[in-house]
Interface confidence: medium
């Protein structure tokens, strides 16, 4: 009686169980009553990462330098190429399909966390008492100058984008 299910690493075809091709190989022809499954290794720049009955290997991912990508890990016949971003860029998504320049924090915002290869710059608003007057991918919010410690007084209040302006204390003549 023909089988209705096959063992692991086998597949059912023409009422019989054939061996799957191992990772790194593709199917050329199914087994018959008299012959084994015929498999062939994937070509250069191709891969298959599972036991399979695929007739074509998958192409390795191309790490396109025009998209800021470079090879992090070269693909093999059993694994895909892994791309990552060039220095100063980060992936736009989990699969790292492309890269963008690290975001700068606008004036009034400081860098909370500097960007990495997979995550963008994280900005935070400068709280009261701090300012940032530049657009930067690494500058934190700076504290306002303390006029008192310089024996000066505040002549112009600070904002989240500007430092305080200190001046001499008014003295009685």
């Amino acid at each position: 009686e023909p089988p209705t299910a096959c063992r692991e690493k086998q597949y059912l075809i023409n009422s019989q169980c054939c061996s799957l091709c191992q990772p790194g190989q593709k199917l050329v022809s199914d087994c018959t009553e008299f012959t084994e499954t015929e498999c062939l290794p994937c070509g250069e720049s191709e891969f298959l990462d599972t036991w399979n009955r695929e007739t074509h290997c998958h192409q390795h991912k191309y790490c396109d330098p025009n998209l800021g990508l470079r090879v992090q890990q070269k693909g093999t016949s059993e694994t895909d190429t892994i791309c990552t971003c060039e220095e100063g860029w980060h992936c736009t998504s989990e699969a790292c399909e492309s890269c963008v320049l690290h975001r700068s924090c606008s004036p009034g915002f400081g860098v909370k966390q500097i960007a990495t290869g997979v995550s963008d710059t994280i900005c935070e608003p400068c709280p009261v008492g701090f300012f940032s007057n530049v657009s930067s991918a690494f500058e934190k919010c700076h504290p306002w100058t303390s006029c008192e410690t310089k024996d000066l007084v505040v002549q112009q209040a600070g904002t989240n984008k500007t430092d305080v302006v200190c001046g001499p204390q008014d003295r009685l003549r």
Epitope: D49, H58, D80, C91, T92, A95, L101
Partner: antibody, heavy 115, light 112 residues
Framework: QVQVQESGPGLVKPSDTLSLTCTVS????????MSWIRQPPGKGLEWIGA???????YYASWAKSRVTISVDTSLNQVSLKLSSVTAADTAVYYC?????????WGQGTLVTVSS | DIQLTQSPSFLSASVGDRVTITCQAS??????LAWYQQKPGKPPKLLIF???NLASGVPSRFSGSGSGTEFTLTISSLQPEDFATYYC??????????FGQGFGGGTKVEIK
């Protein structure tokens, strides 16, 4: 051949759940992000959400409470479920490869919400 | 979500004209912006990503520029096959809980 194809019912009743499947070929879902986008008749494109190559899900704020996107890498399929549908959900639904760089799109499937 | 404001919404032009479409993002998205062309009854086609990088097979009359919040798509000399609707799409991603994504409202380029 590298391609993406959406499938599912063309007619859904109000308050039901819309279920669509996106079947891909020629590339591995574990190496790419997949997005769902819709386009109401005569209107612009609206991003619904995405599933990352590592399995993370991302939803538009309007869709968070109603949408579920999942992937079955063994079947080369990505699915979209949108609950509690109304006539406003009538649209062509597209599945596309990528996140912002949507370089491969399906032909789209029109879903009409009507009783 | 990120808001992307595209202008103009409609544009009448003649073959050979230079056409410019702008897209403004509600927050800094670096160069993470794509442009698409869509013809009636068809899915959109990727033209540019990121910001100024032409997708494979796209004619050189198309160009993109900008970064941060202001972006521009230019068609240097409009051809008959360029009459279509154009969309910008942008976003940023740092984690599953910190991301933004959106499309512009579209610009329909019609024959004058």
């Amino acid at each position: 051949q590298v391609q993406v194809q959406e499938s599912g019912p063309g007619l859904v009743k109000p308050s039901d759940t819309l279920s669509l499947t996106c079947t891909v070929s020629g590339f591995s879902l574990s190496s790419y992000d997949m997005s769902w986008i819709r386009q109401p008749p005569g209107k612009g494109l609206e991003w619904i959400g995405a599933i990352g190559g590592a399995g993370g899900t991302y939803y538009a704020s309007w869709a968070k409470s109603r949408v579920t996107i999942s992937v079955d890498t063994s079947l080369n399929q990505v699915s979209l479920k949108l609950s509690s549908v109304t006539a406003a959900d009538t649209a062509v639904y597209y599945c596309a490869r990528g996140w912002t760089r949507l370089d491969l799109w399906g032909q789209g499937t029109l879903v009409t919400v009507s009783s | 979500d990120i808001q992307l404001t595209q202008s103009p919404s409609f544009l009448s032009a003649s073959v050979g004209d230079r056409v410019t479409i702008t897209c403004q993002a509600s927050e800094d998205i670096s160069s993470n912006l794509a442009w698409y062309q869509q013809k009636p009854g068809k899915p959109p086609k990727l033209l540019i990503f990121p910001a100024s990088n032409l997708a494979s097979g796209v004619p050189s009359r198309f160009s993109g520029s900008g970064s941060g919040t202001e972006f521009t798509l230019t068609i240097s000399s409009l051809q008959p096959e360029d009459f279509a609707t154009y969309y910008c799409q942008g976003g940023y991603w740092t984690s599953t809980s910190n991301f933004g994504q959106g499309f512009g409202g579209g610009t329909k380029v019609e024959i004058k």
